[in-house]
Interface confidence: medium
Amino acid sequence: LVPHLGDREKRDSVCPQGKYIHPQNNSICCTKCHKGTYLYNDCPGPGQDTDCRECESGSFTASENHLRHCLSCSKCRKEMGQVEISSCTVDRDTVCGCRKNQYRHYWSENLFQCFNCSLCLNGTVHLSCQEKQNTVCTCHAGFFLRENECVSCSNCKKSLECTKLCLPQIENVKGTEDSGTT
């Protein structure tokens, strides 16, 4: 199967690596701009230089390109608890992350929020907290895991998944049936 190529990829594939087809003259291959720069003017002819200009403050290009504009630098989302790991430069976007003892929870592919790593109170650390994953806890006897916290079996109602873990205690628990809600 031949992969589907967009118009720009088709045009680029005719030229050797590091060059692109002049948009007005498909017999000319112009040299792409280095990262940190953008295309100001196409090369006037074969073997002549492409006019590339450095990205302005607040913008970047991270790879060789023939973009007419640099990309805007990302801003770390303070309301998501994000902190700036490294500032934006002309050739690299801002890098955002979380503070120490926090992990990234990705709500969607490009959106993450920082949460505190679980401390596994009333349990032990099974897997340590990682950059993109909370601590995995194992609970002590008399406790069950709910939303990665060790909760006393006295909070276990008969219809919940905790019943197996809290089997010896469950008979003493008073509470109404609770169809899967927690």
Partner: nanobody, 123 residues
């Protein structure tokens, strides 16, 4: 094209009620778990409630437990959030979201979101 369209938000007094709806299209609604998430002004996202494909299992954040009820009508491709005993701290933009998978996961990841509906609780 997947679309999620929330409605039902508005201004309500403390102690009042609202029912949010989320009309889904562009995917087989009955095949996916759904979630309500909210974002208070200037704050991060907060997971509110989750419901499985068939509407049998539901989960709630502690902050809304006993006051909010999530439900779905697969014949109408619609997700609901009944909000009672509303408090000032419930003021937020409420989003419905489609889960990536059918796995039971709290704080899961979403591949599609609605545009949100604003709920303001104020006297």
């Amino acid at each position: 094209e997947v679309q999620l369209l929330e409605s039902g938000g508005g201004l309500v007094q403390p102690g009042g009620s609202l029912r949010l709806s989320c009309a889904a299209s562009g995917f087989t609604f009955a095949d996916y778990n759904m979630t309500w998430v909210r974002q208070a002004p200037g704050k991060g996202l907060e997971w509110v409630s989750w419901i499985d494909q068939e509407g049998v299992f539901t989960y709630y954040a502690d902050s809304v437990k006993g006051r909010f009820t999530i439900s779905r009508d697969n014949s109408k491709n619609t997700l609901y959030l009944q909000m009672n005993s509303l408090r000032a701290e419930d003021t937020a933009v409420y989003y419905c979201a489609k889960d990536f998978s059918a796995a039971v996961m709290l704080r899961t990841s979403f591949d599609y979101w609605g545009q949100g509906t604003l709920v303001t609780v104020s006297s």
